[in-house]
């Protein structure tokens, strides 16, 4: 065993090349200089090393850089990245978007691993905020990335980043996340005129308060039913029948098919049946004629 730790004569690696795939693990350990490996990391990816051999190469880099790898090495890790643990990655200082892209490419097509999550966290923290280019990159690899962030993390997203968000990126966001993102979107798109603005803001409306929905109803936006169904129930309830009619435009007819689902069901219960009848859709369940509507929340506040 002791003899095996010395590199056999003539086997000392002069460069990282294909001949190394025939080396046993102990030979790689003994014959490959860590500094040489670090400077020629870009070649490793092109060589079909076994997972066991990659373990050896990783071990050599760990010994050379006990405090964490420099970015020049990280950028060229390639498949060796899959061997890294979150603990390894926490030692890194990744500042280049190109480095991030290179490592995400290695994991492409797979679920977000703990390693990738740690890498992204380190990168975003290093930048101070989730800027547009970073968000563009992350959502390209992981469409659900934005919705994996907590509301607190989302609060640090600058409005300019919102321009990079596609409707599908918000599919898995819950109302708490949209509550944070919607004001950012409002800021981001404020220089747009009515119709252009609506196209952009539409995906974020699950975070819109009643006041904004009322304002939108004055803009002839013709909101589709799919968007309407994603609105916050508490934001929809105070809308009048006339406001909902204006908001949906020709899509108002779709209310009939959704009358048993929230928020339509709850909204119907709050409207006078007379008002609902004016839509001519046969919506039932409104407040009957002659009934007095008491706002219990107001009553509680007074008592």
């Amino acid at each position: 065993e002791v003899e095996k730790t010395a590199c056999p004569s003539g086997k000392k690696a002069r460069e990282i090349d294909e001949s190394l795939i025939f080396y046993k693990k102990w030979e790689l350990e003994a014959c490959v200089d860590a500094a040489l490996l670090a400077t020629q990391m870009d070649r490793v990816n092109a060589i079909p090393f076994t997972y066991e051999q990659l373990d050896v190469l990783k071990h050599k880099l760990d010994e050379l850089y006990p405090q964490g790898y420099p970015e020049s090495v990280i950028q060229h890790l390639g498949y060796l990245f899959l061997k890294m643990s979150p603990e390894d990655i926490r030692k890194w200082n990744v500042t280049s978007l190109e480095t991030l892209k290179a490592l995400l490419e290695v994991n492409k097509g797979h679920e977000m691993s703990p390693q990738v999550a740690t890498l992204i966290d380190r990168f975003v923290k290093g930048r101070g905020q989730l800027d547009k280019d970073t968000l563009d990159t992350l959502t390209a690899f992981y469409p659900g990335y934005l919705c994996s962030l907590s509301p607190e993390e989302l609060s640090s997203v600058p409005p300019s980043s919102i321009w990079a968000v596609r409707p599908q990126d918000l599919d898995t966001c819950d109302p708490r996340q949209l509550d944070v993102l919607y004001p950012k979107a409002r800021l981001a798109f404020q220089n747009m005129n009515g119709s252009e603005y609506f196209v952009k803001i539409q995906s974020f409306l699950g975070g819109a308060p009643t006041e904004d929905l009322k304002a939108l109803s004055q803009q002839n936006v013709s909101m589709d039913l799919a968007t309407f169904m994603k609105l916050r129930t508490d934001a929809v309830l105070p809308l009048t029948v006339a406001e909902v009619q204006k908001l949906l435009g020709p899509h108002v007819e779709g209310l009939k098919a959704e009358e048993r689902h929230r928020p339509v069901r709850d909204w119907i219960l709050r409207q006078r049946q007379d008002d609902l009848d004016t839509l001519g859709l046969g919506l039932q369940g409104g407040i009957p004629n002659g009934y007095l509507v008491l706002d219990l929340s107001m009553q509680e506040a007074l008592s």
């Epitope: 509301p151 989302l154 609060s155 600058p158 409005p159 300019s160 708490r176 509550d179 944070v180 993102l181 919607y182 004001p183 950012k184 409002r186 800021l187 798109f189 404020q190 220089n191 747009m192 603005y197 803001i201 308060p209 006041e211 904004d212 304002a215 939108l216 803009q219």
Partner: antibody, heavy 122, light 106 residues
Framework: EVQLVQSGAEVKKPGASVKVSCKAS????????VQWVRQAPGQGLEWMGI????????TYAQKFQGRVTMTRDTSTSTVYMELSSLRSEDTAVYYC???????????????WGQGTLVTVSS | SYELTQPPSVSVSPGQTASITCSGD??????ASWYQQKPGQSPVLVIY???RRPSGIPERFSGSNSGNTATLTISGTQAMDEADYYC?????????FGTGTKVTVL
């Protein structure tokens, strides 16, 4: 007439923090965005950031990122702006302003507080 | 970073028209607002979204915005209009205020 009433003048040492409050007299205060703007003596206006009606979403000017925190207490209709690591250049009048005008893409500052003078001096 | 440039001062006789310009790269692609500030007082919004007047603001205040320049026009200027005026626009992640213009009514 809706009014925004701000806390009184403050004198702080460099490195300290200051927390300015902004309280509305109207009952609908919690429906509106509140922005903060400052004005150094004899200088122009400088935007610091904005907080949404529920208080869950804030956006800060890049210049103040990491030093400013805006919070909201909806139960008392009060918004707070805290600025840390104060330096002499932070000596200014700090204003809160409410956006309550029309429209969905509107952020005009319609109602302003009276301003709070913060002096940073050793 | 985005900058909005205004003339430091504009002088106008009572009853005449005062025009204050605000220049910035492609400012016409953004909405411009204007604020009036009198000495020792908080600012007041006089124009928003280029040319809209908040309720309570006199009709003599009007605005326009195209190309690289937004303009605030005060027609039939009165002594009470003497103040500092600031333009404002949203760019990227921040509101930018103009350098300010002192309007003096002679």
């Amino acid at each position: 007439e809706v009014q925004l009433v701000q806390s009184g003048a403050e004198v702080k040492k460099p490195g300290a923090s200051v927390k300015v409050s902004c309280k509305a007299s109207g009952d609908t205060f919690n429906r509106y965005y509140v922005q903060w703007v400052r004005q150094a003596p004899g200088q122009g206006l400088e935007w610091m950031g904005i907080i949404n009606p529920s208080g869950v979403s804030t956006t800060y000017a890049q210049k103040f990122q990491g030093r400013v925190t805006m919070t909201r207490d909806t139960s008392t209709s009060t918004v707070y702006m805290e600025l840390s690591s104060l330096r002499s250049e932070d000596t200014a009048v700090y204003y809160c302003a409410e956006t309550r005008g029309p429209g969905f893409n509107y952020f005009g500052m319609d109602v302003w507080g009276q301003g709070t003078l913060v002096t940073v001096s050793s | 970073s985005y900058e909005l440039t205004q003339p430091p001062s504009v002088s106008v006789s009572p009853g005449q028209t005062a025009s204050i310009t605000c220049s910035g790269d492609k400012l016409g692609d953004k909405y411009a607002s204007w604020y009036q500030q009198k000495p020792g007082q908080s600012p007041v919004l006089v124009i928003y979204q280029d040319n809209r007047r908040p309720s309570g603001i006199p009709e003599r205040f009007s605005g326009s915005n195209s190309g690289n320049t937004a303009t605030l026009t005060i027609s039939g200027t009165q002594a009470m209009d003497e103040a500092d005026y600031y333009c404002q626009a949203w760019d990227s992640d921040t509101y930018v205020f103009g350098t300010g213009t002192k309007v003096t009514v002679l």
